[in-house]
Interface confidence: low
């Protein structure tokens, strides 16, 4: 067969769908690989062909579009399952071609089973809500295109196993779920089940996401350096190990990059010749506030090193701060010579 631009297996788009539910999967060519859309391709005389490789097989097979009730069908650049079966799991390929042009990409599709509490191996999207921040909403995800706007689905929301009704601060509003004053106790998995009719059949779409309650921007502060501080002096003798922790608290800020770094005499440690190592550890509070500790270590400190300036710097979207460590050379204790006079002259 003639050459085809093969984009390979697009593992970035590991698609997971629930067993026995409808699934609509768009050919990734038009979304991520080609600079034109399906309509343009179709009007230029290009044909979209689908085939698949079953799980644990090497053989590429055509997709059977003649199953009862059109269980699998193609509409424009979308492959439809109404509904999926467990053995639909495999690698699916969409190929766009005519006599002179060919481009194809494969992607993995995994059909996943869920239990009665919606637990499954599905990777869940995480939605962050600010703590005690007012009304915030999550929306039932990835349900667009399954039914026309004239169809009014029923939507039921669950937290874990429990249907959400008469919850103190969580209110279902159709496709939205409203949280009033989100609290840590609202952390958990939330599931919307969308039920809609189609051609005399009833279909269910199950979508689960994880809600994580995080620090509110109302309470966010610039980074706070707890150490070094004015109360601790790092007093060392030459030859000893110098260890200075820089401990910084960062308020949670959505999409903020938290940075901590040391400078020695105004330079980054990499830019100076002394043998210095930096070890970093990170811990998080329940609301994802972050504490970063960077320990600056010089194994055998010299008297020159003890005269240098060691400054800890921190930066977040809220601001930048710096604090110098108090480092000094230990003054040797004076040696007292004790002379004992033994013979007291007797008169």
């Amino acid at each position: 067969s003639e050459r085809c631009d093969d984009w390979g297996l697009d593992t970035m788009r590991q698609i997971q769908v629930f067993e026995d539910e409808p699934a609509r999967i768009k050919c990734p060519l038009f979304e991520h690989f080609l600079k034109f859309n399906y309509s343009t391709a179709h009007s230029a005389g290009l044909t979209l062909i689908w085939y698949w490789t079953r799980q644990d097989r090497d053989l590429e097979e055509p997709i059977n579009f003649r199953l009862p009730e059109n269980r699998i069908s193609k509409e424009k650049d979308v492959l439809w399952f109404r509904p999926t079966l467990l053995n639909d799991t495999g690698n699916y390929t969409c190929m766009l071609r005519n006599t002179t042009y060919c481009s194809k990409v494969a992607f993995p599709l995994e059909v996943v089973q869920k239990d009665s509490c919606f637990n499954s191996p599905m990777k869940l999207p995480v939605h962050k809500l600010y703590i005690e921040y007012g009304i915030q909403r999550i929306t039932c995800p990835n349900v667009d295109g399954y039914f026309p706007s004239s169809v009014k689905p029923t939507i039921t929301w669950y937290m874990g196993c429990y249907k959400i009704q008469n919850f103190n601060n969580v209110i279902p509003e159709g496709m939205n779920l409203s949280f009033l004053i989100a609290l840590i106790s609202n952390n958990g998995n939330y599931t919307c089940v969308v039920t809609y009719p189609e051609n005399g059949r009833t279909f269910h779409l199950t979508r689960t996401l994880t809600v994580k309650v995080v620090g509110s921007p109302k309470n966010a502060v610039p980074p706070v350096i707890h150490s070094p501080n004015d109360h601790v002096v790092y007093e060392k003798e030459p030859g000893e190990e110098l260890l200075i922790p820089c401990t910084v608290y960062f308020s949670f800020l959505m999409d903020s990059r938290n940075e901590v770094w040391w400078t020695i005499d105004g330079k980054k440690p990499d830019d100076i010749t002394i043998d210095v190592t930096i070890n970093e550890s990170i811990s998080h509070s329940r609301t994802e506030d972050e504490t970063r500790t960077q320990i600056l270590s010089i194994k055998k400190v010299t008297s020159e090193d003890l005269k240098r300036s060691y400054v800890c710097h921190a930066r977040s979207a809220k601001g930048e701060v710096a604090k110098a460590a108090k480092v000094k050379q230990k003054v040797p204790a004076p040696r007292y010579t004790v002379e004992l006079a033994c013979g007291f002259g007797a008169t």
Partner: antibody, heavy 120, light 108 residues
Framework: EVQLEESGGRLVQPGGSLRLSCAVS????????MSWVRQAPGKGLEWVST???????AYASWPKGRFTISRDNSKNTLYLQMNSLRAEDTAVYFC??????????????WGQGTLVTVSS | DIQMTQSPSSLSASVGDRVTITCQAS??????LSWYQQKPGQAPKLLIY???DLESGVPSRFSGSGSGTDFTLTISSLQPEDFATYYC??????????FGQGTKVVIK
Amino acid sequence: EVQLEESGGRLVQPGGSLRLSCAVSGFSLSSYDMSWVRQAPGKGLEWVSTIYIGGTTAYASWPKGRFTISRDNSKNTLYLQMNSLRAEDTAVYFCARLQGANYYNSLALWGQGTLVTVSS
Amino acid sequence: DIQMTQSPSSLSASVGDRVTITCQASQSIYSFLSWYQQKPGQAPKLLIYAASDLESGVPSRFSGSGSGTDFTLTISSLQPEDFATYYCQCNYIIDYGAFGQGTKVVIK
């Protein structure tokens, strides 16, 4: 410019019906929660009803099914259908936009109001 | 339903005075409370939301405090344009929107 403009207020007899409209401009009605608030002559503000983005509606306890809030997103218009009107429904009716999806349900933008008079 | 009780119902004050208006909810509403100012013949104007957050464009002499059931609106130094009626409103839970009965601030 972002604004709300109420219309439809007039003199109506007790037992009659009226539909108030609130035309919004400068923003998309479908993206905001909206409320109706009324104020009887010389009296305080009284919340009537709210329609949320998701379509959920909420009412004060006193209309007891006589009032219905709705919206037409394609016309960018909010409505209040008032049936079985009583003399005590006489008031200026304001429509108001709530602050935004992730805020505290405050009424941040108000129209100038339309006067409904119920009298025989 | 939640009831909102505002006090005083009216107060007379002079320009430059510090004015305090209180609002009490019949049950905890966390910080779901707004304050509005209304002048005769005009629509109300949002001053404070979330009990203490100043709406943009509102002068900093207005401040709000409180949470749970007890809330306060303070005008630190009354200006001539501040003579108006002030309302608190409960914003907690989707089916509550009750207003306080209003506090009229008049010139002494």
